[in-house]
């Protein structure tokens, strides 16, 4: 058993049928010595008396808010949560496996640049009685500071019969140098509590590996005289790290017909313009990627040919 | 990525082309190592990220773009003395800092070159003959060093008398390649920045 926060405790259980559970001793936070009784949640049934209460915690029915009273007055509370260990592996019931980029990915994180600011998000089908708290650091043995905000519900989607909820959090490394070569990964830890179930999820990454630039901005077409060709031009996104000559991007320009089956023409360039043939009803799209370190491509910025 | 290879203009900053080749070569070598050594801990998540140049060179700090020198977090630089007469500086008014930057890059390359050559000698003794260093990568390191053209003491290749532990050597190769790729990215960024300056 360990303390999650004041008066909230997590009991770790080896979770299998007929498991013996864990013996837990609760102590009433009071100078009083006698006349103390204990109850669980809203029930008025007295579980025991005395300054301490010993319970055998086996299942969720044994978890909840234990309260010690004296003469009708509440003295203190202890909330017991359960953390299930199923065959040596901590349970992951609360969050959905996003399966991207690999199986067992519960937290996904992205950064728009090298400033040390990043966003993480996760998915759940649970809509109520759910709380999250997020901590982060650079490295784990001698952790350096990363400050995270509160996790917020950022999107709701309908997936088949289920509703899916997306939560996200923004974090900022306290003293980040965009040009630094990372040798210690960022660690992100999310505590999730659903009713009386506790779970924790972690992710470890280097900012350089989670970079995903915003799409190029100001995408424009300039027709070339007496030609089906057009000059496409664009600019670095505002959110990208500066100077651009140091934090350079490379670009992919794509000409896509109306039908998804039509052949796509693609050109790769380090410049912020390209000359392409504009077909009728086609659209031109451009996306960006760090020129020197192949992390994710940005989403496409698009303009119609017409 | 199948990107068209840019060929430098004659007037272009001479080292940019070499640094691009370097990054391409080390990235290819790392990819090959990860595929060949699939049963070894060779991914970014599994290895310890060690920097053999730590406390010996200060490339990131010495090569910091002017725009980032206002960022306090970037200015924890160490004092290191370097030789300052490089041909990449040819016909350019260069500050002392730029000379320091390029000589720091040169020292990095020299240290990695020695490590890679020592390691290759060990790998050649492996009866499994599982992996060797790409000669192209070693040649590209050499070319960039020549382009930088700093006079510096030659570092003797480390020779080892004891029987090599091939498992450890291969893990060390992965660690070295990951670190060198990160340094090659920095070198490429620096060359691109200097070329634009």
């Amino acid at each position: 058993i360990w303390e999650l926060k004041k008066d909230v405790y997590v009991v770790e259980l080896d979770w299998y049928p007929d498991a013996p559970g864990e013996m837990v001793v609760l102590t009433c936070d009071t100078p009083e010595e006698d006349g103390i009784t204990w109850t669980l949640d809203q029930s008025s049934e007295v579980l025991g008396s005395g300054k301490t209460l010993t319970i055998q915690v086996k299942e969720f029915g044994d978890a909840g808010q234990y309260t010690c009273h004296k003469g009708g007055e509440v003295l203190s509370h202890s909330l017991l949560l359960l953390h299930k260990k199923e065959d040596g592996i901590w349970s992951t019931d609360i969050l959905k496996d996003q399966k991207e980029p690999k199986n067992k990915t519960f937290l996904r994180c992205e950064a728009k640049n090298y400033s040390g600011r990043f966003t993480c998000w996760w998915l759940t089908t649970i809509s109520t009685d759910l709380t999250f708290s997020v901590k982060s650091s650079r490295g784990s043995s001698d952790p350096q500071g990363v400050t995270c905000g509160a996790a917020t519900l950022s999107a709701e989607r309908v997936r088949g019969d289920n509703k899916e909820y997306e939560y996200s959090v923004e974090c900022q490394e306290d003293s980040a140098c965009p040009a630094a070569e990372e040798s210690l990964p960022i660690e992100v830890m999310v505590d999730a509590v659903h009713k009386l179930k506790y779970e924790n999820y972690t992710s470890s990454f280097f900012i350089r590996d989670i970079i995903k630039p915003d799409p190029p901005k100001n995408l424009q077409l300039k027709p070339l005289k007496n030609s089906r060709q057009v000059e496409v031009s664009w600019e670095y996104p505002d959110t990208w790290s500066t100077p651009h000559s140091y934090f350079s991007l490379t670009f992919c320009v794509q000409v896509q017909g109306k039908s998804k089956r039509e052949k796509k023409d693609r050109v790769f360039t380090d410049k912020t313009s390209a000359t392409v043939i504009c077909r009728k009803n086609a659209s031109i799209s451009v996306r960006a990627q760090d020129r020197y370190y192949s992390s994710s491509w940005s989403e496409w910025a698009s303009v119609p040919c017409s | 990525r199948n990107l068209p290879v840019a060929t430098p203009d004659p007037g272009m900053f001479p080292c940019l082309h070499h640094s691009q080749n370097l990054l391409r070569a080390v990235s290819n070598m790392l990819q090959k190592a990860r595929q060949t050594l699939e049963f070894y801990p060779c991914t970014s998540e599994e290895i310890d990220h060690e920097d053999i140049t730590k406390d010996k060179t200060s490339t990131v700090e010495a090569c910091l773009p002017l725009e980032l020198t206002k960022n306090e977090s970037c200015l924890n630089s160490r004092e290191t003395s370097f030789i300052t007469n490089g041909s990449c500086l040819a016909s350019r008014k260069t500050s002392f800092m730029m000379a320091l930057c390029l000589s720091s890059i040169y020292e990095d390359l020299k240290m990695y070159q020695v490590e890679f050559k020592t390691m290759n000698a060990k790998l050649l003794m492996d009866p499994k003959r599982q992996i060797f260093l790409d000669q192209n990568m070693l040649a590209v390191i050499d070319e960039l060093m020549q382009a930088l053209n700093f006079n510096s003491e030659t570092v003797p290749q480390k020779s080892s008398l004891e029987e090599p532990d091939f498992y450890k050597t291969k893990i060390k190769l992965c660690i070295l390649l990951h670190a060198f790729r990160i340094r090659a990215v920095t070198i490429d960024r620096v060359m691109s920045y200097l070329n634009a300056s």
């Epitope: 979770w15 299998y16 049928p17 007929d18 065959d87 040596g88 592996i89 199986n103 | 801990p41």
Partner: antibody
């Protein structure tokens, strides 16, 4: 004590269907994940499928994906394996088992796919 | 499609020490715990070892398990006639959990 009693096995022709049941008692069935494991005659153990305690997630071996469906009825304390498009290579003893560091197995039920 | 490899058979005389190996990889045994089962002919498997080296109550102490890196082993010190059975190791893979990964199985024969 924990008990898992299996039923539903038998002889079936290739291409036909069969449903296996596993009745649980002696524990809070709705709190635990459950597996199906099979063993072809003279062969080793092969995992078939898993279902979460609440039925929200199901996982299958590639060899049965799209043909077998694992399900549970927590009000009846019963686990099921619906097997469709059966093949000769599905011939095996099928076991249900609880998920956890200490597990409990059903007695096994024989499924024979033969024309 | 077995990822955990065991020797097909091992044998020993009563009282001898018999060991069975179970070889896996970094993504299974390397980062998950190992179980060992004993299966007597015509019966369901019986749990002998969980959590690499833990014995459930009721399992004789002549059975012991260990794990090192990407391999695990089961030792029977002072093997007895009633130990003649098939033995299976089991673990999980990091990417496919909760799918059970079973070993290929080992037939233990007690001679004499």
């Amino acid at each position: 004590q924990v008990q898992l009693v299996q039923s539903g096995g038998g002889v079936v022709q290739p291409g036909r269907s069969l449903r296996l049941s596993c009745a649980a008692s002696g524990f809070t069935f709705s709190s635990y994940g459950m597996h199906w494991v099979r063993q072809a005659p003279g062969k080793g153990l092969e995992w078939v499928a898993f279902i979460r305690y609440d039925g929200s997630n199901k996982y299958y071996a590639d060899s049965v994906k799209g043909r077998f469906t694992i399900s549970r009825d927590n009000s009846k304390n019963t686990l099921y394996l619906q097997m469709k498009s059966l093949r000769a290579e599905d011939t095996a003893v099928y076991y249900c088992k609880t998920h956890g560091s200490h597990d409990n197995w059903g007695q096994g039920t024989m499924v024979t796919v033969s024309s | 499609s077995y990822v955990l490899t065991q020797p097909p058979s091992v044998s020993g005389t009563p009282g001898q020490r018999v060991t069975i190996s179970c070889s896996g990889g970094r993504s299974n045994i390397g980062c998950n715990t190992v179980k060992w089962y004993q299966q007597l002919p015509g019966t369901a498997p019986k749990l002998l070892i969980y959590g690499n080296d833990q014995r459930p109550s009721g399992v004789p102490d002549r059975f012991s398990g260990s794990k090192s890196g990407t391999s695990a082993s089961l030792a029977i010190t002072g093997v007895q006639a009633e130990d003649e059975a098939d033995y299976y190791c089991q673990s999980y893979d990091r990417g496919t959990h909760p799918a059970l990964l079973f070993g290929t199985g080992t037939k233990v024969t007690v001679l004499g």
